[in-house]
């Protein structure tokens, strides 16, 4: 069951991300930022299942890209970062297989380009913030908390999709 696999993978990714913290977040309170997470894209009601999966895929892909940069490698403990990236990569493979499976079952698998664009813009804001803050430890700490929050949303969307099965 791919959705179940993804949900478990997401939980593992969240635990790894939680373990990756290197500095006290309480020293970074002033650095917090509203990145405008596109929550409406994750409410899971207005989508076909294929569309929801494609939004989840974009979310994981962008997270993978963010944590695959050189700046990210310098910020995090290497073995945890590798485990986290591997977990995300596995989820991407699972979701791609899931899309293929769903496309065969749904009559009109429309691509929800607006939703995907909203996710990309969200990550652009995160990247811009990191650049502005010169990839400081506090900037990365703020981003880590933000990604944990957004991964939690995608886990919840996954649960709702599973209930629809």
């Amino acid at each position: 069951d791919l959705p179940q696999t993804h949900s478990l993978g997401n939980r593992r990714a969240l635990i790894l991300l939680a373990q990756m913290g290197r500095i006290s977040p309480f020293s970074c309170l002033k650095d917090r930022r509203d990145f405008g997470f596109p929550q409406e894209e994750f409410d899971g009601n207005q989508f076909q299942k294929t569309q929801a999966i494609s939004v989840l895929h974009e979310m994981i892909q962008q997270t993978f890209n963010l944590f695959s940069t050189e700046d990210s490698s310098a910020a995090w403990e290497q073995s945890l970062l590798e485990k986290f990236s591997t977990e995300l990569y596995q989820q991407l493979n699972n979701l791609e297989a899931c899309v293929i499976q769903e496309v065969g079952m749904e009559e009109t698998p429309l691509m929800n380009e607006d939703s995907i664009l909203a996710v990309r813009k969200y990550f652009q804001r995160i990247t811009l913030y990191l650049t502005e803050k010169k990839y400081s430890p506090c900037a990365w700490e703020v981003v880590r908390a933000e990604i944990m929050r957004s991964l939690s949303f995608s886990t919840n969307l996954q649960k709702r999709l599973r209930r629809k099965d």
Partner: antibody
Amino acid sequence: QVQLQESGTVLARPGASVKMSCKASGYSFTTYWMHWVKQRPGQGLEWIGVIYPGNGDTTYNQKFKDKAKLTAVTSANTAYMELSSLTNEDSAVYFCTRNYKYDYYTMDYWGQGTTVTVSS
Amino acid sequence: DIVLTQSPASLAVSLGQRATISCRASKSVSTSGHSYMHWYQQKPGQTPKLLIYLASNLESGVPARFSGSGSGTDFTLNIHPVEEEDAATYYCQHSGELPFTFGSGTKLEIK
């Protein structure tokens, strides 16, 4: 379901120390910050401090820095708070509460509270 | 420390009417898009319950008659229409900087 089970009522003498516990269940104990909050009878709430069970990292309200010590034992899924040099001012209900929404620092689940009474 | 001043200290509201509780911070608790102010409800003999986070976000499972607003230093909790079960003490809490502090509470009585 998430539960925070706190130790029972404590009666202590002035000058003594007490250690209360908060056993967590229903979630990944090591990946959520745990706050401690004080409430004196008929009064408001005071934030004491917070601990991250995953690595033992703590942050205190300066007011309680020399009064409270927060620890956690991950194998037992339990957080502890020790209060030292007790005075009548320390008579209160103490809550452990789970941090919520990551760096928004709100509190979703609360223990039932440990009542500490300091009396000679 | 940021001091949160709640007003009124107590109020009595008729069933079905609006209850408005104010929380004023001695310093801004808003930064870069978020207002780090939250609201809790505590009924006698019970633990506090989170109602609103980040000034205006309704916590899951909380009835829509509860709403929060404000930014910077001035925040408001509204309850409309008030129901019997809303009789409780309401606290604001900020997480703008250390130490986090709570307001002194507002006791709501239903007439």
